[in-house]
């Protein structure tokens, strides 16, 4: 009987117990982006640091070629922040020239690529018009939410304009996921 | 044999199991800031409410003197939102005066102090240029991510200008962390 | 004795162990809002998709009539993003007309309704002045934090102006919660 003292009862456990420290987890940080070919109408994907400084991957969560690889099915919390910076947006120049005032924008998308679906799935999008008065502007877009993922799924972060991403500091632009 | 029925198998458990309700957790909320001495080139740290209203600390996660004290090594999700508010930024005044248009900015940094590294580590930064047309402006900066912390580490939230922080409501400006 | 090999010790476990996959969780996504009556000085609540596309509820976390229903007491991480979009805010029109320059604003509130308290409790608020130069603007407000909730509590997302919410894509505007 003693052996059962702290063994969870049948009512409490509907799935295998597992130690929290054993769950797939990753926090990736920004690196300088090398220009890569990307297709028309498709936002380019960022690549990331996965082991230096604050960055890590653990418990079979691997990073390869812009993708976080999901090693185990389950519910994951996924997050990213991208800090953008630029010179005065064209918006104000267009406005001064008296042309239609269409604002510029900055967009971050966290995308899932899965075997079971032919198209990538946009999980999260943060998009913001940029129509700044100042000559230099900078601002972050933060995203985070929970999704049910399958083993073998791949996650990436796409941005509207890779040249506007602030890659100078690991605390400004990052991407992470962890199994709940 | 019966005693083993729900004991996790060797394959499933690589670290001690622990009850989720027993994990260190804190959610701190804003209080009116008393001016404190801070040193040159160092953003001032906010202090926080830790037990009234929505605020709490539990399971050995303690708050003292601007710091959340990490009681146990592991992976933590850390988050903060700071709502800033101000009058028209100097940016537009500078612009009107015809001087170079350098935008003002607002910045939040979540900082770790650890005894295993000689200087504070910036974990997360949200920084935004402020160049508002309106006479009064207000806006939040939100941050959140996962980090591996050590027992004894200290976390704080630093801001670029403590006088711009909206301390009026506990739901506008807050800081929290929990062991995953 | 063998039966105890991986059973957690008394020191490690202070509450019943439970499988992570069995915890209440939900991720809700935006739908087109039908105009509903809301009381003066009270922000309207959004309603949500709870089962199509990326949306789901599981493990007794239910969605009904704009509310997430909390099935079990504990600490929950709650999050939402609302993307707003609009035409030029009145702010700039007021300014051109020489009247006092009061900025417009956009606000998101995550609210808890509980049996044990007569008033709804605002858990999280993101509020931002909008005083855009461009003719069309769009931007997200993101919120997320941890709260101690009671069985039977209800969560909703309120916004300052339902007509400004971008309901076009499930990745732009969403609401979720999960038991830690």
């Amino acid at each position: 009987l003693k052996g059962q003292e702290f063994a969870p009862s049948h009512q409490q456990v509907y799935a295998p117990l597992r130690a929290d420290g054993d769950k797939p987890r990753a926090h990736l940080t920004v690196v300088r982006q090398t220009p890569t070919q990307h297709f028309k109408n498709q936002f380019p994907a960022l690549h990331w640091e996965h082991e230096l400084g604050l960055a890590f991957t653990k418990n079979r969560m691997n990073y390869t070629n812009k993708f976080l690889l999901i090693p185990e099915s389950g519910d994951y919390f996924i997050y990213s922040q991208v800090t953008f910076r630029g010179m005065t947006s064209e918006c104000s120049e267009i406005r001064q020239a008296g042309r239609p005032n269409k604002p510029d924008s900055i967009t971050v998308v966290i995308t899932k690529v899965t075997d079971s679906y032919p198209e990538p799935t946009q999980l999260l999008m943060g998009t913001k018009s940029v129509c700044e008065v100042g000559s230099n502007w900078f601002q972050p877009i933060y995203l985070g939410a929970m999704f049910s993922l399958q083993e073998g799924d791949k996650l990436m972060v796409n941005v509207s304009d890779i040249s506007l991403v602030d890659y100078t500091k690991e605390d400004k632009t990052f991407f992470g996921a962890f199994l709940l | 044999l019966k005693g083993q029925e729900f004991a996790p198998s060797h394959q499933q458990v690589y670290a001690p199991l622990r009850a989720d309700g027993d994990k260190p957790r804190a959610h701190l909320t804003v209080v009116r800031q008393t001016p404190t001495q801070h040193f040159k080139n160092q953003f001032p740290a906010l202090h926080w409410e830790h037990e009234l209203g929505l605020a709490f600390t539990k399971n050995r996660m303690n708050y003292t003197n601007k710091f959340l004290l990490i009681p146990e090594s592991g992976d933590y999700f850390i988050y903060s939102q700071v709502t800033f508010r101000g009058m028209t930024s100097e940016c537009s005044e500078i612009r009107q005066a015809g001087r170079p248009n350098k935008p003002d900015s607002i910045t939040v940094v979540i900082t770790k102090v650890t005894d295993s590294y000689p200087e504070p580590t910036q974990l997360l930064m949200g920084t935004k240029s402020v160049c508002e047309v309106g006479s009064n402006w207000f806006q939040p900066i939100y941050l959140g991510a996962m980090f591996s912390l050590q027992e004894g580490d200290k976390l704080m939230v630093n801001v670029s200008d403590i006088s711009l922080v909206d301390y009026t409501k506990e739901d506008k400006t807050f800081f929290g962390a929990f062991l995953l | 004795l063998k039966g105890q090999e991986f059973a957690p010790s008394h020191q490690q476990v202070y509450a019943p162990l439970r499988a992570d996959g069995d915890k209440p969780r939900a991720h809700l996504t935006v739908v087109r809002q039908t105009p509903t009556q809301h009381f003066k000085n009270q922000f309207p609540a959004l309603h949500w998709e709870h089962e199509l596309g990326l949306a789901f509820t599981k493990n007794r976390m239910n969605y009904t009539n704009k509310f997430l229903l909390i099935p079990e007491s504990g600490d929950y991480f709650i999050y939402s993003q609302v993307t707003f979009r609009g035409m030029t805010s009145e702010c700039s029109e007021i300014r051109q007309a020489g009247r006092p320059n009061k900025p417009d604003s956009i606000t998101v509130v995550i609210t808890k309704v509980t049996d044990s308290y007569p008033e709804p409790t605002q858990l999280l608020m993101g509020t931002k002045s909008v005083c855009e130069v461009g003719s069309n603007w769009f931007q997200p407000i993101y919120l997320g934090a941890m709260f101690s909730l009671q069985e039977g509590d209800k969560l909703m997302v309120n916004v300052s102006d339902i007509s400004l919410v971008d309901y076009t894509k499930e990745d732009k505007t969403f609401f979720g919660a999960f038991l830690l």
Partner: antibody
Framework: QVQLVQSGAEVKKPGASVKVSCKAS????????MHWVRQAPGQGLEWMGR????????KYDPKFQVRVTMTTDTSTSTVYMELSSLRSEDTAVYYC?????????WGQGTTVTVSS | EIVLTQSPGTLSLSPGERATLSCRAS?????MYWYQQKPGQAPRPWIY???NLASGVPDRFSGSGSGTDYTLTISRLEPEDFAVYYC?????????FGGGTKLEIK
């Protein structure tokens, strides 16, 4: 400027205790960690332990665990190291230092002589 | 505890020469720290987190290494560089120092 000023030299008899102080200026000690290191004559450096002045939390080298006590008085920005049951081999220069904030600063040292 | 072994114990060189001081850990550490000490003075922080020079340290000094093997290098010795150098690890408790390398004028 940032500095640590330690108390003066001490001469103690075997079996007695000594309490060395270290007063900080130019920074808030609660923002850092304070360490104690000793150096016996002609020998190398030996880490004794550290205190987190914000929480009072200490970590000691097991070698000193039963004899050393580190404390803080935040109102005066001072940390203390008390070593009990002194023996002749405790004769050394005792240094306080800080970590968690650059520059990594050391006190000038306090000479403790244990002699009968 | 993690034992740090410094070699050589004493290094005799002339000004203008290159000096290489070694510190080996008994198990892997994240970073190494180096201190300079002159007779009658407190140790001075010299290199932190393996390769970062403390304020005021000339750039003829450099630090490198990872895992268990770390090195302090002085590209061209100046008279004021002759002193004792200690390595220290902060990765495991207790913190430990190496026994020191005495850099003396030949």
């Amino acid at each position: 400027q940032v500095q640590l000023v330690q108390s003066g030299a001490e001469v103690k008899k075997p079996g007695a205790s000594v309490k060395v102080s270290c007063k900080a200026s130019g920074f808030d000690i609660q923002d850092t960690y304070m360490h104690w290191v000793r150096q016996a004559p002609g020998q190398g450096l030996e880490w004794m332990g550290r205190i987190d002045p914000a929480s009072g939390h200490t970590k000691y080298d097991p070698k000193f665990q039963v004899r050393v006590t580190m404390t803080t008085d935040t109102s005066t920005s001072t940390v203390y190291m008390e070593l009990s049951s002194l023996r002749s081999e405790d004769t050394a220069v005792y240094y306080c230092s800080r970590s968690g904030g650059l520059p990594d600063v050391w006190g000038q040292g306090t000479t403790v002589t244990v002699s009968s | 505890e993690i034992v740090l072994t410094q070699s050589p114990g004493t290094l005799s060189l002339s000004p203008g020469e290159r000096a290489t001081l070694s510190c080996r850990a008994s198990s892997s550490v994240s970073y190494m720290y180096w201190y300079q000490q002159k007779p009658g003075q407190a140790p001075r922080p010299w290199i932190y987190a393996t390769s970062n020079l403390a304020s005021g340290v000339p750039d003829r000094f450099s630090g490198s290494g990872s895992g268990t093997d770390y090195t302090l290098t002085i590209s061209r010795l100046e008279p004021e560089d002759f002193a004792v150098y200690y390595c220290q690890q902060w990765s495991g408790n207790p913190r430990t120092f190496g026994g020191g390398t005495k850099l003396e004028i030949k």
